[in-house]
């Protein structure tokens, strides 16, 4: 058993049929010695008396808020949560496996630049009695600070019969060094509590591996005289690291017909303009990627040819 | 060419070669994210690798103030990786495919390090750790780790030379 926060404790349970329960001794936080009684949750029934209460925690029915009282007055609370371990593996019932980029990916994170700011998100089908708490650091043995905000519900989607909820959190490395080569990964730890179930999820990454620039901005077409060619121009996204002479992007320009089956013409360039042939009803799209490190491409920025 | 003591390197040549290094490093090991090498424990490999750190002056401001600190650090790293790519980690079993980009990568590392330090001039180089994996699978894993680490290193080096070429060239 360990303390998650003040008056909240996590009991780690081996979850198999013939596992013995965990013996837990609760102590009432009071100088009083006599006349102390214990109750659980909303029930007013006395579960035991004395400054300590010894319980066996085996089921979610044994978890909950234990309260000690004296003469009708509440003295202290202890909320017990359960963390299940099945076949030696901690349960992952609360979050959905996003399966990208690999199985057992519960947390996904992205950064728009090298500033040390990143966003992580996760999915769940649970809509109520759910809380998250996020901590992060650079490295784990001698951790350097990363500050994370509160996790918030960022999207709701209907997936078949189920509703899916997306939560996200923004974090910022306290002393980021955008130009340095990272040697220690960022660690992100999410504590998830659903009713009386506790779970924790972790992700470890280098900022360089989660970079995904915003799409190029100000995408414009300039027709070339007496030609079906156009000059496409764009700019670096505002959110990208500066100076651009140092933090350079490379771009992919694509001409795509109306039909998805039509052949796509693609051009790669380090410049912020390109000359392409604009077909009728086609659209021109541009996306960006770090020039020197193959992390994710940005989403496409698009304009119609006409 | 970078001459120890203060003169500037051939920024544009260094830029072109370092960008080529980036391309080669990624073609040698393109599996981004498919194998999480950090799960395999990096202690013996990457702890000894020379990283370009915050105080090495490789940021735009540091380069403007005095690019020599950064260039020396890059040179150290290039020599380190060049030795690693020439070691039995890459020459031993399992053999690399004949058209593997590792050979070109090795040559380009040497080429860029020579651009930075002509014959007869010596910067302090870092001792290469004695890594001699016994099993072919260990060697394979080590190659992946080294190439992943090299990708990060050459990306920073390429940024330095691109910025130098754009802002510090005579």
């Amino acid at each position: 058993i360990w303390e998650l926060k003040k008056d909240v404790y996590v009991v780690e349970l081996d979850w198999y049929p013939d596992a013995p329960g965990e013996m837990v001794v609760l102590t009432c936080d009071t100088p009083e010695e006599d006349g102390i009684t214990w109750t659980l949750d909303q029930s007013s029934e006395v579960l035991g008396s004395g400054k300590t209460l010894t319980i066996q925690v085996k089921e979610f029915g044994d978890a909950g808020q234990y309260t000690c009282h004296k003469g009708g007055e509440v003295l202290s609370h202890s909320l017990l949560l359960l963390h299940k371990k099945e076949d030696g593996i901690w349960s992952t019932d609360i979050l959905k496996d996003q399966k990208e980029p690999k199985n057992k990916t519960f947390l996904r994170c992205e950064a728009k630049n090298y500033s040390g700011r990143f966003t992580c998100w996760w999915l769940t089908t649970i809509s109520t009695d759910l809380t998250f708490s996020v901590k992060s650091s650079r490295g784990s043995s001698d951790p350097q600070g990363v500050t994370c905000g509160a996790a918030t519900l960022s999207a709701e989607r209907v997936r078949g019969d189920n509703k899916e909820y997306e939560y996200s959190v923004e974090c910022q490395e306290d002393s980021a060094c955008p130009a340095a080569e990272e040697s220690l990964p960022i660690e992100v730890m999410v504590d998830a509590v659903h009713k009386l179930k506790y779970e924790n999820y972790t992700s470890s990454f280098f900022i360089r591996d989660i970079i995904k620039p915003d799409p190029p901005k100000n995408l414009q077409l300039k027709p070339l005289k007496n030609s079906r060619q156009v000059e496409v121009s764009w700019e670096y996204p505002d959110t990208w690291s500066t100076p651009h002479s140092y933090f350079s992007l490379t771009f992919c320009v694509q001409v795509q017909g109306k039909s998805k089956r039509e052949k796509k013409d693609r051009v790669f360039t380090d410049k912020t303009s390109a000359t392409v042939i604009c077909r009728k009803n086609a659209s021109i799209s541009v996306r960006a990627q770090d020039r020197y490190y193959s992390s994710s491409w940005s989403e496409w920025a698009s304009v119609p040819c006409s | 060419r970078a001459v120890p003591g203060g003169s500037s390197p051939a920024w544009t040549q260094c830029q072109q070669l370092s960008q080529k290094l980036c391309t080669l490093a990624w073609s040698a090991h393109p599996l981004v994210g498919h194998m999480d090498l950090r799960e395999e424990g990096d202690e013996e490999t990457t702890n000894d690798v020379p990283h370009i750190q915050c105080g090495d002056g490789c940021d735009p401001q540091g380069l403007r103030d005095n690019s020599q600190f950064c260039l020396q650090r890059i040179h150290q790293g290039l020599i380190f990786y060049e030795k690693l790519l020439g070691s039995d980690i890459f020459t031993g079993e399992p053999s690399l495919l004949p058209d593997s980009p590792v050979g070109q990568l090795h040559a380009s590392l040497l080429g860029l390090s020579q651009l930075l330090q002509p014959e007869g001039h010596h910067w302090e180089t870092q001792q290469i750790p004695s890594l001699s994996p016994s099993q072919p699978w260990q060697r394979l894993l080590l190659r992946f780790k080294i190439l992943r680490s090299l990708q990060a290193f050459v990306a920073v080096a390429a940024r330095v030379f691109a910025h130098g070429a754009a802002t510090l060239s005579p």
């Epitope: 007013s44 209460l53 010894t54 066996q56 | -």
Partner: antibody, heavy 119, light 107 residues
């Protein structure tokens, strides 16, 4: 006052189905799991299983799994034990009981339902 | 599953005497053992839990002791209403199991 009131005695034929009930009152129904115990004529007590009234989480004795089904209706604070096809060997007194949280034993018992299966 | 063996199977005693019933487990159940009393035609009633804690409303003449595999229920001075069948139950490991019972009869 805590009370578990069980449905009346049943006489059934082999192969018939049956559902007996146990209505709880006088306490917070969702805080306490409900269990069932069998006592065959002239025999001792046998633990059938327990169930959570919150989410219907169930722990069956392997000996009874597939033979009986436990269920619960939160809205009426009632637990059920049912058979889809009774056998003569199901003849027994069935008790519902309240599981004490933080322990696991049964602190309050229903009066019992006698089930007789005979052709 | 854990087997609980009670002894004796039948105990004959007189009111005012001390009665001791033993319960032995086939493997350790820590202190997670309860005792119940059952009178003819009635449901069992909880007496002792966690090996030695008296259920509220149970007279002080009933006491429990033991841990691990050996447990004892003691009635210090028998009253006429104490003559009944007594069961021990372990609730450490599923499936929870009961002893076969001890009949306490008037000598």
């Amino acid at each position: 006052e805590v009370q578990l009131v069980q449905s009346g005695a049943e006489v059934k034929k082999p192969g018939e189905s049956l559902k007996i009930s146990c209505q709880s009152s006088g306490y917070s129904f969702t805080t306490y799991w409900i269990g069932w115990v069998r006592q065959m004529p002239g025999q001792g007590l046998e633990w059938i299983g327990i169930m959570s009234p919150v989410d219907s989480d169930i722990r069956y004795n392997p000996m009874f799994r597939g033979q009986v089904t436990m269920s619960v209706d939160k809205s009426s604070s009632t637990a059920y034990l049912q058979w889809s096809s009774l056998k003569a060997s199901d003849t027994a007194m069935y008790y519902c009981a309240r599981r004490r949280p933080g322990q696991g034993y049964f602190d309050f018992w229903g009066q019992g339902t006698m089930v007789t299966v005979s052709s | 599953e854990i087997v609980l063996t009670q002894s004796p199977a039948t105990l004959s005693a007189s009111p005012g005497e001390r009665a001791t019933i033993s319960c032995r487990a086939s493997q350790s159940v820590s202190s997670w053992l309860a005792w119940y009393q059952q009178k003819p035609g009635q449901a069992p009633r909880s007496l002792i839990y966690a090996a030695s804690n008296r259920q509220s409303g149970i007279p002080a003449r009933f006491s429990g002791s033991g841990s691990g595999t050996d447990f004892t229920l003691t009635i210090s001075s028998l009253e006429p209403e104490d003559f009944a069948v007594y069961y021990c139950q372990q609730y450490n490991i599923y499936p929870y199991t009961f002893g076969q019972g001890t009949r306490l009869e008037i000598k």
